[in-house]
Interface confidence: low
């Protein structure tokens, strides 16, 4: 499929101008190669009309230009003084006309409307409101006022002052007769439909002295805004429909066959299953505007999207709408990363998050997508040393391996951790990716004691048992804190006896704490890694207490099978400030995630995304 993208249809009127934008992947080669606009012939060739190398056909002389914007990956063709002869099929493309790096564009130039003299033209967007003003003379002040629509050869009554309303306009039209001072009546039609377009006639009086006024109503279908985004990236649709629909339900839908528009998300709580875990509808402003963020873009997300307002929360005739044509570029700069990561209860996952490598200094974030209402994504951890209180000791964001990827490790997994998580930064908002964590049946691979109490001044050894499957991995112990996990010296004490059917390659690696102090209290992790890529981890909380006791204490594996002492764990937690994105609009705007705080801890329902790209908890 060609990665070039532009408008499928362009409509205009004789004498007007059009501006056609074509998008291309902004690679170094593409930025500098020839750009062209050509007209397709009946026999399949494509005759160049204008190119970026300076060529302009005689048909376009003095009325067209082509401008390349390499930094945006776009070029624009402007054509003026359009005639009906310009109607036809065109291509915008890169390189040689016949090479296929192009996009088909249909240009339709229609005749301007033949208007009667003294006709007032009203040009209004679909779904909006028009007020047709109709002046009259004093002698007709007390006479019947009416509005007709010209249907073929005949005028059809739409509304009159005796109370008649044409059924096609019921509930969306009114006739206002101003106070006696003003010789004017107005007809207001709202929720405009395409079928409302046409010639109208206002009339005051019914005899030969009646006052008449012609009006031409043009109802505009919104031209879709072209949106060009990378596969696996994200898109934000900003929808501003105006304050008059501020209190009406909003929706985003995707056009399927014909005129159908399937709801993607709406403010009444509906959400299409295909977007579960990767969509947020951001709260409305007072003016009724809102935005929708979709992450983890897929090929099948490409298409035409409409946002609108209607009490049903879906597209209806007369809904005010805005339109976008989304193209998903498969030559993506965003690397593949697993969309599903699996872990077992009590075990861990290590999630790789891609980011724009040009923004290595940006703040990295990880948040939990919550589907309730319109979706939100409260932050769990960031790269500046903040971790949500409930995740202390079991969650860490590491800048490794770097160069466009960071790592998030979550351990002590429970079924409540199943769900969708977003990787994001305060830099390029297009680099938002989604990963689903699934909790599957099984036992954690690493075995550690459930809880450990150390005595001040003593020496403590905490064991971690690694099965033979990790024989080639680097094994480590570290002390967890808000900014990561600081490596500690550890001792390989030989083969472990903790695993059945595991040869001499299983290992027991101990953490030794000499002369325990209060500062040693906290969370310790043992784990495996290969270079800068992290695998499984297991966590132990070490509590410190005063007790007169001699010698050192070994913590045996027998304790590892004991259930963790929840009281010790709870008392060990140090409440720190809790942080989340309170205003999800920050996702939708090109700016940093604000340093706001939120105590909310929402539901963790998991819905299968149906992805085939999966990652086990211990693989990378």
């Amino acid at each position: 499929k060609s990665p070039i993208f532009g408008p499928e249809e362009v409509n205009s009127v004789e004498g007007n101008s059009v501006s056609i934008t074509c998008y291309y992947p902004p690679t170094s080669v593409n930025r500098h190669t020839r750009k062209y606009w050509c007209r397709q012939g009946a026999r399949g060739g494509c005759i160049t009309l204008i190119s970026s190398e300076g060529y302009v056909s005689s048909k376009y002389a003095g009325r067209a230009n082509l401008t390349n914007f390499p930094e945006n990956g776009t070029f624009v063709v402007n054509i003026a003084q359009l005639s009906q002869d310009d109607s036809g099929r065109y291509k915008c493309g890169l390189g040689i006309n016949s090479r296929g790096l192009s996009f088909d564009v249909s240009l339709e130039v229609s005749q301007g409307p033949g208007l009667l003299n003294d006709t007032k033209v009203y040009t209004v967007d679909l779904g909006r409101t028009v007020t047709i003003n109709c002046p009259f003379k004093t002698e007709n002040a007390q006479k019947r006022k009416s509005l007709y629509k010209q249907i073929g050869l005949y005028p059809v009554l739409v509304i009159d002052s005796s109370g008649y309303v044409n059924p096609n306009y019921t509930g969306r039209i009114r006739l206002d007769i101003q106070g006696t001072g003003q010789l004017l009546f107005s007809v207001v039609i709202n929720q405009l439909r395409l079928s409302d377009a046409g010639q109208y006639l206002c009339q005051a009086g019914d005899d030969s002295n009646s006052n008449k006024k012609n009006a031409d109503l043009q109802v505009l279908k919104p031209e879709p805004e072209l949106v060009y985004e990378d596969l696996r990236g994200s898109v934000t649709f900003h929808c501003a429909l105006g304050p008059e629909v501020a209190n009406v339900a909003k929706f985003l839908c995707r056009q399927s066959s014909g005129e159908n528009c399937d709801v993607v998300v709406n403010t009444l709580g509906k959400r299409a299953p295909a977007f579960e875990g990767r969509i947020l509808l951001n709260p409305q402003d007072k003016d009724g505007s809102f935005s929708v963020v979709i992450t983890g873009l897929r090929k099948e997300d490409a298409g035409r999207y409409l946002c609108g307002a209607h009490s049903d929360g879906q597209l209806q005739e007369g809904s005010p709408i805005q339109a976008w044509q989304l193209f998903v570029n498969e030559e993506s700069t965003i690397p593949r990363s697993p969309t599903v990561v699996k872990g077992v209860a009590g075990g861990s996952v290590a999630v790789l998050c891609p980011y724009n490598r040009k923004e290595s200094k940006s703040i990295k974030y990880w948040c939990l997508w919550e589907g309730a209402q319109n979706g939100r994504c409260p932050l769990l951890v960031d790269s500046e040393g903040w971790v949500k209180a409930q995740y202390e000791g079991r969650l860490s964001l590491l800048e490794e391996p770097g160069n466009g990827t960071f790592t998030v490790i979550l351990n002590q997994l429970t079924s409540r951790d199943a769900g969708f998580y977003w990787c994001l930064t305060n830099g390029d908002t297009l680099w938002r990716t989604t990963v689903e964590i699934k909790i599957i049946e099984g036992e954690p691979n690493l075995k550690v004691p459930g809880n450990v109490t150390a005595v001040l001044g003593e020496t403590l050894k905490v064991p971690c048992h690694f099965p033979c499957k990790f024989s080639s991995y680097e094994k480590y112990w570290c002390k967890w804190n808000n900014t990561g996990c600081q490596a500690l010296p550890s001792q390989d004490e030989g083969p472990s006896k903790a695993f059945v059917n595991c040869d001499e390659n299983s290992r027991l690696v101990s953490l030794t704490l000499n002369l325990v102090t209060r500062a040693d209290e906290g969370w310790y992790w043992c784990g495996v890694k290969q270079g800068h890529f992290y695998g499984e981890t297991a966590a132990v909380y070490v509590a410190v207490e005063e007790r007169k006791a001699a010698g050192s204490r070994d913590v045996s594996l027998a304790k590892a099978d004991a259930a963790p002492d929840e009281k010790v764990l709870d008392s060990g937690f140090r409440e720190i400030e809790n942080k989340a994105i309170q205003d999800p609009r920050l996702f939708a705007e090109e700016k940093a995630v604000a340093d706001t705080r939120d105590q909310a801890d929402g539901s963790r329902a998991s819905v299968d995304s149906g992805s085939s790209e999966e990652q086990g908890g211990s693989s990378r």
């Epitope: 002052s161 109370g163 969306r172 009114r174 206002d176 101003q178």
Partner: nanobody, 121 residues
Framework: EVQLVESGGGLVQSGGSLRLSCAAS????????MGWFRQAPGKERELVAV????????SYADSVKGRFTISRSNAKNTVYLQMSSLKPEDTAVYYC??????????????WGQGTQVTVSS
Amino acid sequence: EVQLVESGGGLVQSGGSLRLSCAASGRAFNYYAMGWFRQAPGKERELVAVINWSGGTTSYADSVKGRFTISRSNAKNTVYLQMSSLKPEDTAVYYCAADSIYRTSKDYNYWGQGTQVTVSS
């Protein structure tokens, strides 16, 4: 269809005040002009005050100008008539009316059942 229910009528002394309310049910209340009319025994129904859909235009009978005020709340689907400096000749059944057309005649499409206002001297 619009259904209208008036309330707030009653007996009041001359010079007193009353506030009538008219609650509308049905769709698109804010697209209707609303009016208050009255009918005294043995007399024709007459216009008291009307207000357009937005509240931006109002019209009053000469006999009530400066004493009565019509207003509306589209959020509450209600139109009000604040009556002060009441006179015995204001005694009548007061009717609320609605129409998609703002007019100062009696040709309104939808009517309430009425509420009695009696002003004693």
